[in-house]
């Protein structure tokens, strides 16, 4: 079973501590070098007006996952209670595409880095999603921030079009999925 | 839904191998770490090791270092341990598990017994 | 290697008690531990992945807590079916480690 929302919400950039956009064909492209080169164009929708949704009110869908950026500045477990708050999980990225269709949505926030769902114990530990499943650097690489002073970036966050590990406790933004089956 | 499925009981002499297989269903394969469990008769759970099945990398418990060998078959969906050197008190239930958040052990297979006894 | 210990190694209770079990690394792990639940003859069972995360369909009697070196599980209300042994597990360095267990019986 499908659940359908219903939405009438305005499309603002920032409404109730979320970041909206109605569609993102519009987006300034990223400065640094970019990951969306390879990737074909988003099919993204957010569901604003009176229509049937899977997702609710102010998440963005993209093929078979709603999705949330949030604007409220937490560390990256925070994030990841917020997220499982509203019955999601932080984001996985699971294909290019999809990796193409995020880069397009945080290139709008230049200046805003968000967590994803990404973390590991320690360095000598591998990288793992929060569901459980392995990391593949086949996606997509992990930019370390790491230096003497801050050995152990373990959680990591994507900006603009790059990906880096960070302190975990660092507060930031957050990227909140939510699968859907049709 | 979730299963993991492992061979049967097996009996062994000391010095021998045994290798213990453990067949997936209902997710990707090789998306998930599969972790290897002992527990020996009355005692504790010991972690043996892991398998990336995705790209067949290991990680085995120092303690069994030189005698433990971890595989998988893909196009099977089925992890194998193998151990060899076989000693008397290897004697175990021997678990594989799923690696689930936070690098938890989230489905398990029912366990293989193997002995080992002259 | 990082050193679990649990006490009780064993406890007596009823059903309907609350009861507490503490788990204590070596060293700090952070977050990164479970608890699982193991009748006699089966395998073990998830019941709670970092430190306080309840399992899903793992009922809500079941809760964890703690952060560093000291964490706890609590059943709020014991029923029939908790008896059982209880291990904690950490997951912060190789090799992952479990703790000795800690046996719930019936009083």
């Known amino acids: 079973t499908m659940a359908i929302w219903r939405s009438n919400s305005g499309s603002n950039t920032l409404e109730n501590g979320y970041f909206l956009s109605r569609n993102k064909e519009n987006h300034s492209q990223p400065t640094q070098s970019s990951l969306e080169d390879s990737v074909t164009p988003t099919k993204a929708v957010k569901t604003t007006g009176v229509l049937s949704s899977p997702c609710p009110p102010n998440w963005i869908i993209y093929e078979k996952s709603c999705y949330l950026f949030s604007m409220s500045l937490n560390s990256w477990d925070g994030s990841k209670r917020q997220c499982w708050q509203l019955g999601s999980n932080l984001l996985k990225i699971d294909s290019s595409n999809e990796l193409g269709f995020i880069v397009k949505q945080v290139s709008s926030q230049p200046d805003n880095s968000f967590w994803i769902g990404l973390s590991r114990p320690q360095t000598e530990v591998p990288w793992l999603w929060e569901d459980g499943s392995t990391f593949s650097s086949n996606l997509f690489q992990i930019r370390t921030t790491a230096t003497q002073e801050n050995p152990s970036p373990n959680c990591v966050w994507i900006h603009v079009s790059v990906i880096y590990d960070q302190l975990c406790s660092v507060p930031s933004y957050s990227i909140c999925e939510k699968k859907f089956s049709m | 839904q979730v299963q993991l499925v492992q061979s049967g009981a097996e009996v062994k002499k000391p010095g021998a191998s045994v290798k213990v297989s453990c067949k997936s269903s209902?997710?990707?394969?090789?998306?998930?770490?599969i972790h290897w469990v002992r527990q020996a008769p009355g005692q504790g759970l010991e972690w043996m090791g892991w398998?990336?099945?995705?790209?067949?990398?290991?990680n085995y418990a120092q303690k069994f270092q030189g005698r433990i060998t971890m595989t998988r078959d893909t196009s099977i969906s089925t992890a194998y341990l193998e151990l060899s050197r076989l000693r008397s008190d290897d004697t175990a239930v021997f678990y594989c598990?799923?690696?689930?958040?936070?690098?938890?052990?989230?489905?398990w297979g029912q366990g293989t017994l193997v002995t080992v006894s002259s | 290697d990082i050193q679990m210990t649990q006490s009780p190694s064993s406890v007596s209770a009823s059903v309907g008690d609350r009861v507490t079990i503490t788990c204590r690394a070596s060293?700090?792990?952070?977050?990164?531990l479970a608890w699982y639940q193991q009748k006699p003859g089966k395998a073990p069972k998830l019941l709670i992945y970092?430190?306080?995360s309840l399992q899903s369909g793992v009922p809500s009697r079941f809760s964890g807590s703690g952060s560093g070196t000291d964490f706890t599980l609590t059943i709020s209300s014991l029923q029939p079916e908790d008896f059982a042994t209880y291990y904690c597990?950490?997951?912060?360095?190789?090799?992952?480690?479990f703790g000795p267990g800690t046996k719930v019986d019936i009083e």
């Open positions: 598990a799923r690696n689930s958040g936070s690098y938890s052990f989230g489905y």
């Open positions: 209902g997710y990707t394969f090789t998306d998930y770490y």
């Open positions: 398998i990336n099945p995705n790209s067949g990398d290991t």
């Open positions: 060293q700090g792990i952070s977050s990164w």
């Open positions: 970092g430190a306080s």
């Open positions: 597990q950490q997951a912060y360095s190789f090799p992952f480690t």
